[in-house]
């Protein structure tokens, strides 16, 4: 699908919102004020929010968003059907799961309906914009007298995620962290029974199914150690 640049109807005030840029044409070219950047995130491949800074506009403007997918069966231009608002001005668009196609180039166009020449078209790789939900159901198993194993679950295809485990004792000033691949388990080989440990995990859609840079939120922490339950020292799933 070729991007069409919408042209004005001739009735616009061409003196208000314009500034000069060095465009490659024979005569001096006049361009409108740039539109805000659109930033999209796909939350656990359940929905996607594409947002922009509506306060960057010189005056309150209900910008409109259209989108399509390049080179695909979904290349028909779609209007945003669910706008997000900030102080009663459009500031984003939410797309539902059925409208998300991770491995096709997503094209998003922001436009000022009062000045059709004011439009900006961006291209995005949605597989690099996935943010999974935080890991859940953290559990600790005591494998031996001094070895602990941490397990957790994700509400997504496990092989698509990598993880970061952080742990520390009450005596530590900072976290120790360890990267974990798609296996979503972590072993701590040497545990001091006199200390209380705290563990937490976050996940990222990388590297097998995408190249996302953003991590999920941290899980709820789980604790193990000197002041945890003595009744079953071999299985703990206590959340803070």
């Amino acid at each position: 699908l070729n991007t069409t640049i919408l042209t004005p109807n001739g009735n616009e005030d061409t003196t208000a919102d314009f500034f000069l840029t060095t465009m490659p044409t024979d005569s001096l070219s006049v361009s409108t004020l740039p539109l805000p950047e659109v930033q999209c995130f796909v939350f656990n491949v359940e929905y996607m929010n594409c947002t922009w800074n509506s306060s960057s506009e010189p005056q309150p403007t209900n910008l409109t968003l259209h989108y399509w997918y390049k080179n695909s069966d979904n290349d028909k231009v779609q209007k945003c059907s669910h706008y997000l608002f900030s102080e009663e001005i459009t500031s984003g668009c939410q797309l539902q799961k059925k409208e998300i196609h991770l491995y096709q180039t997503f094209v998003v166009q922001l436009q000022d309906p009062r000045e059709p020449r004011r439009q900006a078209t961006q291209m995005l790789k949605l597989q690099n914009l996935v943010i999974p939900w935080a890991p859940e159901n953290l559990t600790l198993h005591k494998l031996s007298e001094s070895q602990l194993e941490l397990n957790w679950n994700n509400r997504f295809l496990n092989h698509c995620l990598e993880h970061l485990v952080q742990y520390r004792t009450d005596w530590d000033h900072s976290w120790t962290e360890q990267s974990v691949d798609y296996r979503h388990k972590f072993s701590l080989p040497s545990v001091d029974g006199q200390k209380r440990y705290t563990f937490r995990v976050r996940s990222r859609f990388n590297p097998l199914c995408g190249s996302a840079q953003h991590w999920s939120e941290w899980s709820h922490p789980i604790h193990w150690g000197s002041n945890t339950s003595k009744e079953n020292p071999f299985l703990f799933a206590l959340e803070a």
């Epitope: 991007t3 640049i5 840029t21 060095t22 465009m23 361009s31 409108t32 740039p34 539109l35 950047e37 659109v38 930033q39 999209c40 094209v107 166009q109 020449r117 439009q119 900006a120 078209t121 961006q122 291209m123 995005l124 790789k125 690099n128 914009l129 840079q213």
Partner: nanobody
Framework: QVQLQESGGGLVQAGGSLRLSCAAS????????MGWFRQAPGKEREFVAC???????FYADSVEGRFTFSRDNAKNATYLQMNSLQPEDTAVYYC????????????????????WGQGTQVTVSL
């Protein structure tokens, strides 16, 4: 403010290759979205390729699989490797840049770019 200068254009036979360079001066390109556009005589300027400073690259349908966009932030330059050139690729090729806040911002709309080079002529003969 960044200044952009293209080079590498020329006359080439159909099926041949060229590598265009876009050198930036005045400021680093590390936080700029970059694009290549072209304009053939009597035609509108058209999108060729673009990238975000986060590393995502995109192409127009007409050049996908033949052209490759790359950037070298250390050299403050971007490149357009053009293979399997056809006569319809004949045009003046322009490099463009826009400072962006987000690593994922890549523009295919020419009016989103604030800085332009002067262009380099590419002519493909049969």
């Amino acid at each position: 403010q960044v200044q952009l200068q293209e080079s590498g254009g020329g006359l080439v036979q159909a099926g041949g290759s060229l590598r265009l360079s876009c050198a930036a001066s005045g400021r680093t390109l590390s936080r700029y979205a970059m694009g290549w556009f072209r304009q053939a005589p009597g035609k509108e300027r058209e999108f060729v390729a673009c990238d975000s400073w986060g590393g995502d690259t995109f192409y127009a349908d007409s050049v996908e699989g033949r052209f490759t966009f790359s950037r070298d932030n250390a050299k403050n330059a971007t490149y357009l490797q053009m293979n399997s050139l056809q006569p319809e690729d004949t045009a003046v090729y322009y490099c463009a840049g826009a400072p962006t806040s987000f690593a994922t911002t890549a523009y295919s709309s020419s009016n989103s770019y604030t800085v332009w080079g002067q262009g380099t002529q590419v002519t493909v003969s049969l």
